[in-house]
């Protein structure tokens, strides 16, 4: 019985991509229900690791260090078999990072997106690193994998990503590796999210007191929707930042936010969008620009009360 | 029962180097990797690095990187750390600290602290 | 590196009262965070180990929850002792960095 029936599945939790210090389960899963297991790293030459050992459920491998990355099996206790032990598990790759300074990240044409749409994500670093990877925050697969291309002192990849649907939505990271050590990943880039758009109806945007205002008169602009949304954002034309507020349930059955942009020193177009809890990343439709105009003395810049998030952070839960 | 005892307080010139020991017993030295924290008057806790003791491996906090080294004595038990180059904001407690086991491990066990003065 | 932010960085209560502080990743951490007490002058202690266990010999007044990036320890029903100040710490890779500390002082 060497077959697929006496194969055993090895797995990692949380996660088969592990930070330098971190620490990482490996499971080595057997329909007959073993517990005891030897694990195998492949690069030494298929001997067991740990001098032999033998585990039982699981082994927490950590604090972990670059010598950690690499390829590992299982092999599953059959006391009845001639050798004693199952057929080699699947090949389970660990990846350790922060070994190299980290890449950059970009997405093309932006990281707001239509459903259906698909994005490039671009990882590139001054370091020539030989492999690109690109993982998305909170999935167990694999990070996939580029060849990266040098171009003028610059190595890049680039993952194209669509076409976009909601479970594609989140938080990216990219990391790079140098040839000899394809396993031993660099830091990770700084998260990117990449947002969803047009999957519920539009909100609806207004400003108090109106769309056109004296320089240096207060303004708010309100988002609400009679969709229970629990977020909402609101983006200005122009600018990379959107300002996010929980929404509030109104006495006329509408959830609405409302958002103090100040004094008024010049205009611009806004937009909102809604999102629920459970997804922050998929997005409503977009409210019907609205064009908030000032009359007076304009200057070059709005002020902001409200903190704008970072170009990362949209994908997190608001508390 | 599990004890980490430590080196006592010191008192150095600037530019001096002081090595701060970390006597461990009550279980294997080297089944456990471990860590050491420096508190600052006044301050916060700051992770410096560790030692692996069953191999020798260390890894820095990038910010203390030139400014320690650490070293461990199966034979004794001991993890020492070396803070060379002292200036006056190295004045601090410094604590050694076990890292437990488990997939999801904390600094179970801590040493008293060896408060270092840097003075000239 | 993983930044932890803790708030509030002082808080008062009274004898009897529940108070909670929390702490932020700013990435996802897997629950690889504990809870810290530390008394003046004394080494801390550990409180609450993966997010969520209580560590031995620690009163049930105190517990931990959370997930992903936010964390919370919560003190029920607040005793003398319990004044100190409160650290949170990751430990999903290094630099195992700590939080900025919360002093809990006697109102």
């Known amino acids: 019985l060497m077959g697929g029936q006496d194969k055993p599945f090895l797995s990692a939790r949380p996660s088969t991509v592990v930070p330098r210090g971190g620490h990482v389960a490996l499971q080595c899963h057997y329909r007959r229900g073993f517990n005891n297991f030897m694990l195998y790293k492949e690069d030494r030459s298929h001997v067991p690791i740990f001098h032999g050992r033998i585990f039982q459920e699981s082994f927490i491998m950590g604090p972990v260090t670059p010598a950690h990355a690499g390829t590992y099996r299982c092999r599953g206790s059959r006391p009845h078999s001639l050798t004693g032990w199952s057929a080699p598990s699947n090949p389970l790759v660990i990846m350790v990072t922060g070994n190299h300074r980290k890449p950059s990240l970009l997405a093309h044409p932006g990281p707001l997106l239509k459903s259906g749409e698909t994005v490039i994500l671009q990882c590139w670093s001054d370091v020539m690193f030989e492999h690109f990877f690109l993982h998305r925050e909170g999935i167990s697969e694999d990070p996939s994998r580029l060849v990266g291309q040098i171009h003028d002192g610059v190595s890049k990849a680039n993952f194209s990503i669509g076409p976009l649907m909601p479970v594609l939505a989140g938080t990216y990271r990219c990391y790079g590796s140098v040839p000899h050590s394809p396993y031993q990943l660099s830091a990770p880039s700084d998260p990117l999210d990449i947002v969803i758009t047009g999957l519920y109806e539009k909100p609806s945007l207004s400003a108090q007191p109106g769309p056109t205002v004296q320089a240096g008169e207060n303004v708010t602009l309100s988002c609400s929707s009679w969709s229970s949304y629990d977020i909402y954002h609101l983006s200005r034309e122009g600018e990379a930042h959107e300002r996010r507020l929980r929404a509030v349930p109104k006495v006329n059955r509408t959830f609405q936010a409302d958002f103090p942009l100040g004094p008024a020193t010049h205009g611009g177009t806004y937009r909102c969008f809604g999102s629920f809890r459970a997804l922050p990343c998929v997005w409503s439709n977009s409210s019907d620009p609205l064009l908030v105009s000032v009359t007076g003395n304009p200057s070059s810049s709005w002020p902001s009360p409200t903190e704008p998030s970072s170009k990362s952070g949209i994908c997190r839960h608001l508390h | 029962q599990v004890q980490l005892v430590q080196s006592g307080a010191e008192v150095k010139k600037p530019g001096a180097s002081v090595k701060v020991s970390c006597k461990a017993s009550?279980?294997?030295?080297?089944?456990?990797?471990m860590h050491w924290v420096r508190q600052a008057p006044g301050q916060g806790l700051e992770w410096i690095g560790y030692?692996?003791?069953?191999?020798?491996?260390?890894e820095n906090n990038r910010k203390f990187k030139d400014k320690t080294t650490m070293t461990a004595d199966t034979s004794t038990s001991t993890a020492y750390m070396e803070l060379s180059s002292l200036r006056s904001e190295d004045t601090a407690v410094y604590y050694c600290?076990?890292?437990?086991?488990?997939?999801?491990?904390?600094?179970?066990?801590w040493g008293q602290g060896t408060t270092v003065t840097v003075s000239s | 590196d993983i930044q932890m932010t803790q708030s509030p960085s002082s808080l008062s209560a009274s004898v009897g009262e529940t108070v909670t502080i929390t702490c932020r990743a700013s990435e996802n951490i897997y629950s690889n965070l504990a809870w810290y007490q530390q008394k003046q002058g004394k080494a801390p202690q550990l409180l609450v180990y993966a997010a969520t266990n209580l560590a031995d010999g620690v009163p049930s007044r105190f517990s931990g929850s959370g997930s992903g990036t936010q964390y919370t320890l919560t003190i029920n029903s607040l005793q003398p002792e319990d004044f100190a100040t409160y650290y949170c710490?990751?430990?999903?890779?290094?630099?195992?960095?700590f939080g900025g500390g919360t002093k809990l002082e006697i109102k």
């Open positions: 710490q990751h430990f999903w890779g290094t630099p195992y960095t």
């Open positions: 030692i692996n003791p069953s191999s020798g491996y260390t």
């Open positions: 600290a076990r890292l437990g086991k488990g997939l999801l491990p904390p600094f179970d066990y």
């Open positions: 009550g279980y294997t030295f080297t089944s456990y990797t």
